[in-house]
Interface confidence: medium
């Protein structure tokens, strides 16, 4: 931090040059200087590096002698007011003002540009006290200037609540030219035209502009800033840059390459995610997409079975994600799958073939002419079918399922029996009397569960009732039968 | 997409220090001046810290001069504060903010935040 | 330092109001003004800079005017994303904030 050298002897504090990592700013505390007359000119100085301008409040002393003289009105004095230099170039400048001793507590700051400077300048106050006006120079200096640097500069005093500012001092830092706007990469059309930008600054104006393809120059004479390049169209992949050419010398812009878009390489890796029944999910990855973004993917499905017809199937989906869960296959099937993805330009080749298979599925029918009759001796209930007619891709029958709901006043409860695959009949115990039996049954395979054959209906009487006659499926199109004993 | 992470923040006792660091990304870090503001719980902004693209020209509030130091290394798109001496009145949620420009000598408005970093001052 | 106070410091209003936020600041300050929005929970959002120039993105609905030490916020049509709570910061010279203006709903 810099620190205040407060001694009595001295009637100006003295602040030390830079100090190394010393970076704090004071900004509300003003230095109140003890000034007596007759003292010849001394120099005060800012915190430099941290540095805001030094805004210290100074007590000049009041000169009685001068209380009844009319005062003239209080101006900075005219300094240069346009100052040109190169980039990284020191700078210094002042504004001065003549200020009566009867006036207390002045105030300078620096501002740029309408706002109030801060720091980062070296700004320095002097003061040359008379017998009755103090002359104090206020020095800003700014090392290495950059172009952020360019601007108004004034000074502001403050004085008994009356603000006094000086004439501008324009600083305007020259150097090579400075690209406000750069060509961009493109990916673009073989054959068809498209424009590049450039754009460029000083000062110093003007700035010229030429155009590069290929480490080629494009235009023989130079245009002026901004300028667009026409390009008729390319064949193949190119590179453009721009040079920026102003009287302090030449900057050139990035190269951008400008690509010609192209269908996409084929998708890699087709890999099988997951397999049911009916349904397989893949994915892909997408290949290099010829400089143009993918539109949509078509994943490709052939049956591989000597008496298919050899058809395609195409399903079409979004080119992201790189995943697709094919749909509405035949079980216990093998397939071969490829995926193909497009760009505004075209399709690309098909990737690389790969095999996949579905699971054996359910069954598709249920178990035939199901009868159902009363055991009153047993207490229970016999239920008899016929094996369905089951195809191939259903796979191996594993079983039966036997649903069976009991229903009486206010009460229903259903009940579920698994039989093995050799069974065509099962007896199942009686749960209620007084009541309705409702049996259904399904074939089962490693596939699943196939559907439920029709409901039929039994009745069974309190106990002492004797009635052996069936109930049995019904023939399409009938009501379910109901059987009362 | 500009973003700005701050962390670092958390439970400390007065006279404690900690150091807050901001993560940036999705810009060009060394080219903008950047600043520290905090919020006491319930409270208003109140600016604390900037430091220019460079590092070579640095402001605090008065009410953390002396305490608080800020930093950067453009080399890991970093900002950070060291705050030391801490006092209760230094709990607060302390966002980074980038300023809109760089000019010497002039802090700007803040056109991006971070979603800020708690700070909890408290024996 | 330069202070600015914003009225009113708490606002009630429904939907498709109009509605204004006044930021008065103790010296000129030309038209370096900036307004935020924040919502709880949330870093502030640039709504306006240089008292009138509307940040990109941000809805139009939101407009500033005012140069000097008078400067005002404006919804024209208030949607509900905007109850939060309103911020002005000048910037000629040491960064300071008005204190707030939370604006609720009706």
């Known amino acids: 931090a810099i620190t205040e050298a407060r001694e009595e002897a001295k009637p100006y504090p003295l602040f030390p040059g830079p100090l190394p990592g010393s970076l704090q700013t004071d900004h509300t505390s003003l230095l109140s200087l003890p000034h007596t007359s007759g003292y010849q000119p001394a120099l005060m100085f800012s915190p430099t590096q941290p540095g805001r301008p030094y805004t210290g409040n100074v007590a000049i002393p009041r000169v009685t002698s001068a209380g009844s003289k009319l005062l003239p009105p209080l101006a900075f004095k005219h300094t240069v007011g346009h100052i040109i230099l190169s980039e990284h170039k020191d700078v210094k400048f002042n504004c001065s003002i003549s200020v009566p001793n009867i006036y207390q507590d002045t105030t300078i700051s620096w501002w740029k540009d309408g706002k109030e400077l801060l720091g980062a300048h070296h700004a320095i106050t002097q003061f040359y006290p008379d017998d009755e006006v103090t002359a104090i120079i206020a020095s800003f200096s700014i090392t290495s200037v950059q172009r952020s640097d360019n601007g108004s500069y004034i000074c502001k005093m403050k004085i008994n609540n009356e603000e006094i500012v000086s004439d501008p001092i324009y600083i305007e830092v020259q150097g090579l030219p400075h690209f406000t706007k750069q060509p961009e990469s493109m990916n673009v059309t073989r054959n068809t035209a498209f424009n590049l930008t450039c754009q460029a600054v000083g000062p110093p104006e003007p700035v010229n502009i030429f155009w590069v393809q290929n480490s080629s120059r494009v235009n023989e004479q130079p245009e002026k800033s901004p300028s667009v390049l026409t390009v008729p169209g390319l064949t193949e992949m190119a590179v453009f840059s721009c040079e920026a050419h102003n009287d302090k010398g030449l900057t050139v812009s990035k190269g951008v390459q400008i690509n010609i878009k192209a269908i996409p390489s084929p998708p890699t890796e087709v890999s099988i995610h997951n397999s049911t029944a009916h349904s397989i999910l893949i994915s892909w990855v997408p290949g290099f997409d010829g400089y143009s973004p993918f539109r949509n993917c078509s994943v490709q499905v052939k049956e591989v079975d000597p008496l298919s017809n050899g058809s395609v199937m195409i399903f079409n989906t979004s080119a992201s994600p790189h995943m697709y869960q094919i749909k509405q296959l035949q079980a216990l099937a093998n397939y071969s799958i490829g995926v193909s993805c497009m760009n505004e330009i075209g399709w690309s080749a098909v990737s690389p073939w790969i095999l996949a298979s579905t699971t054996e599925g359910a069954p598709s029918v249920a178990p035939l002419n199901v009868t159902v009759f009363l055991n009153e001796s047993r207490d229970n209930v016999d239920i008899r079918w016929m094996k369905p007619l089951t195809k191939r891709q259903a796979g191996e029958l594993v079983g039966y399922r036997i649903s069976h709901v009991w229903q009486s006043a206010g009460i229903s409860k259903e009940l579920l029996e698994e039989v093995g695959q050799n069974n065509s009949r099962a007896q199942i115990s009686v749960q209620v009397h007084n009541a309705t039996c409702t049996v259904r049954i399904a074939a089962v395979t490693k596939g699943g569960v196939g559907p439920f054959s029709d409901p039929v209906k039994i009745f069974i009487p309190a106990h002492g009732w004797v009635d052996h006659a069936p109930s049995s499926t019904p023939a399409p199109g009938n009501a379910d039968p109901v059987l009362i004993i | 997409e500009v973003q700005l992470v701050e962390s670092g923040g958390g439970l400390v006792q007065p006279g404690g220090s900690l150091r807050l660091s901001c993560a940036a990304s999705?810009?060009?870090?060394?080219?903008?001046?950047m600043n520290w503001v905090r919020q006491a719980p319930g409270k208003g902004l109140e600016w604390v810290s900037y430091i220019i693209s460079g590092s070579d020209t640095i402001f605090y509030a008065d009410s953390v001069k002396g305490r608080f130091t800020i930093s950067r290394d453009n080399a890991k798109n970093s900002l950070y504060l060291q705050m030391n001496s801490l006092r209760d009145e230094d709990t607060a949620v302390y966002y980074c903010?980038?300023?809109?420009?760089?000019?010497?000598?002039?802090?700007?408005?803040?056109?991006?935040w971070g979603q800020g970093t708690l700070v909890t001052v408290s024996s | 330092a330069i202070q600015l106070t914003q009225s009113p410091s708490s606002l009630s209003a429904s939907v498709g109001d109009r509605v204004t936020i006044t930021c008065r600041s103790s010296q000129g300050i030309s038209s370096a003004l900036a307004w935020y929005q924040q919502k709880p929970g949330k870093a502030p959002k640039l709504l306006i800079y240089?008292?009138?120039s509307l940040e990109s993105g941000v809805p139009s609905r939101f407009s500033g005017s005012g140069s000097g030490t008078d400067f005002t916020l404006t919804i024209s049509s208030l949607q509900p994303e905007d109850f939060a709570t309103y911020y002005c910061q000048q910037f000629i010279s040491y960064p300071t904030f008005g204190q707030g203006t939370r604006l609720e709903i009706k």
């Open positions: 903010a980038r300023d809109e420009t760089v000019v010497r000598g002039v802090i700007n408005y803040f056109d991006y």
């Open positions: 240089d008292a009138s």
């Open positions: 999705g810009f060009t870090f060394s080219s903008y001046s």
